[in-house]
């Protein structure tokens, strides 16, 4: 069928609650494309009827709620004018383990998410709630080790739980809970977060190391497609942001209209002492205006750039 297959990582989800997955794969989905969801290589697309428990909502697949039998491989097919990509997403559903009734009625969810708080600092946890615009989320409640969180050191701010003066005792099994409303029906969303505490050895934060690029120029022909990786090593517990900028602006914002130059999805490889992060920049078509501009990779306080330049004329051709 001429579609290019892309395999995404597995998603492990808990049953009996809403779940949504957005089919985005920059730069493929940045232009005029159509997105269609399928389950287990079925020829029949996922329903677009909003009353269906499982339905497609714009580029999203939405489960209201997720059920035990929903495990499987889902495909979203992205068709552009001249391209077709099929993204495979493996969803595994598990039953929640609820807290003992003697302690309270909240689940002890292990490793759905892992987050870190920094000892002695003011820090925060994030409740990851990714749903389409058709879903309205109510205020978030936070729990730790099956008990609702109370106390002056904790403040709920939108999707974050702010923790002031983090203590070793703040580690534990957290859960954030929200009510999701869709088409007049209400559903409970509950995400488990395993929180550990770290204290940076030494004084102050770590400085990420940009392995590539190295402040250099790249020869590239006009009109070609170019992908450049930014490779960064950083500590496992880092909170540094990695991104590409041009003229001190995020490339995705700078080229928001044309989407001709886009930042890719960050990936990382975990080593014993550090993580190696990769975030690329894609030039769909190199134009004259791109030459001579420094495209900067930022990682925390570290920066490195590439400059595109036209290849030197090859006089041997004459």
């Amino acid at each position: 069928d001429g579609c290019k297959d892309i395999f995404m990582k597995n998603e492990i989800l808990s049953a009996s609650q809403p779940f949504a997955f957005n089919c985005t794969f920059p730069p493929i989905t940045s232009g005029e494309v159509s997105v269609t969801w399928y389950k287990n290589s079925s020829k029949i697309p996922v329903s677009k009827i909003i009353q269906s428990r499982i339905h497609q909502d714009e580029t999203w697949i939405l489960f209201l709620p997720m059920e035990w039998g929903d495990s499987g491989v889902y495909q979203c097919v992205i068709k552009g004018r001249d391209s077709c990509h099929r993204i495979h997403v493996n969803l595994t559903v598990f039953e929640k383990h609820w807290c003992d009734t003697s302690i309270g009625g909240l689940p002890n969810l292990s490793d759905e998410y892992k987050q870190i708080l920094h000892l002695g600092k003011d820090d925060s946890l994030t409740c990851h709630l990714h749903f389409p615009k058709s879903c309205v989320l109510g205020p978030i409640k936070w729990y730790k080790d099956c008990n609702e969180i109370k106390g002056e050191r904790f403040t709920v701010l939108e999707t974050r739980l702010l923790v002031s003066n983090v203590s070793a005792e703040d580690r534990g099994n957290y859960a954030c809970q929200a009510i999701l409303t869709h088409s007049g029906k209400q559903y409970e969303v509950l995400n488990g977060i395993t929180v550990s505490i770290t204290e940076r050895a030494g004084y102050g934060g770590s400085v990420p190391k940009i392995i590539y690029p190295k402040n250099h120029s790249i020869e590239v022909q006009l009109g070609t497609t170019l992908i450049v990786d930014c490779n960064v090593t950083d500590t496992k517990d880092n909170t540094n942001l990695r991104c590409w900028r041009v003229n001190n602006t995020l490339v995705d914002d700078y080229y928001d209209e044309s989407k001709r130059i886009r930042e890719g999805v960050e990936t990382h490889v975990s080593f014993r002492e550090h993580n190696l992060y990769t975030v690329n920049i894609t030039f769909l078509e190199v134009k004259m205006e791109d030459y001579g501009l420094p495209f900067m990779c930022h990682a925390g306080v570290s920066t490195a750039y590439i400059i595109l330049q036209l290849p030197a004329p090859d006089f041997r051709a004459y």
């Epitope: 302690i103 000892l119 080790d145 070793a168 005792e169 534990g172 395993t194 550990s196 050895a201």
Partner: antibody
């Protein structure tokens, strides 16, 4: 392999200060916390305090006014200083490594202990 | 401070027996409970962390269970080298505290 070894004075006069060194090997103090625990002969264990991977310490509230824990990461040494000793501070003093997970704070490796007697 | 109580100070059992040692916390400590073994020569070893996690190198005959305030350490098939004193310890709230101790002897 992981090893911890305490070295102390053995005998301390009442009202004097106690200074014990814990020498570690097989791991880095910038990755693991170190606890101090003592045991009065024939009795149970009492947790004294912990120094984390950076410079943060937590102490047993009953001893906080006379206890101090510090370390030298580069030399793999951890120090316990206790002031104003009395006879009931006579005990075996242990240093013990924490798990380094930042989640459960068990003590996974222990020194053999150093015996301290407070007597004039 | 959280008080940890091991109600049995000494326990006598035969080789091959299943032995259970109990520990109670004065308040809810969720699952933040560890078990240690002290040999007659004073050597201390971690057996179980976070209620039921078996520390590396510890024989699988040792297991832990519980939650909240009531916890137990079980030795499923008593061996001669298990003759020792056992302590529970909470790491839920500072100061971390130990139980009194349970001395295990052979009948």
């Amino acid at each position: 392999q992981v090893q911890l070894k305490e070295s102390g004075p053995g005998l301390v006069a009442p009202s004097q200060s106690l200074f014990i060194t814990c020498t570690v090997s097989g791991f880095s103090l910038s990755s693991y916390e170190i606890n101090w625990v003592r045991q009065v002969p024939g009795k149970g264990l009492e947790w004294l305090g912990v120094i984390w991977t950076g410079i943060t310490t937590n102490y047993n509230s009953a001893l906080i006014s006379r206890l101090s824990i510090s370390k030298d990461n580069s030399k793999s040494l951890v120090f316990l200083k206790m002031n104003s000793l009395q006879t009931d501070d006579t005990a075996i003093y242990y240093c013990a490594r924490g798990t380094g997970t930042g989640f459960y704070y068990a003590m996974d490796y222990w020194g053999q202990g150093t015996s301290v007697t407070v007597s004039s | 401070d959280i008080q940890m109580t091991q109600t049995t100070s000494s326990l006598s059992a035969s080789l091959g027996d299943r032995v259970t040692i109990s520990c109670r916390a004065s308040q809810d400590i969720y699952k933040y409970l560890n078990w240690y073994q002290q040999k007659p020569d004073g050597t201390l070893k971690l057996l179980i962390y976070y209620t039921s996690g078996l520390h590396s190198g510890v024989p699988s005959r040792f297991s832990g269970s519980g939650s909240g305030t009531d916890f137990s350490l079980t030795i499923s098939n008593l061996e001669p080298e298990d003759i020792a004193t056992y302590f529970c310890q909470q790491d839920s709230k500072f100061p971390w505290t130990f139980g009194g101790d349970t001395k295990l002897e052979i009948k």
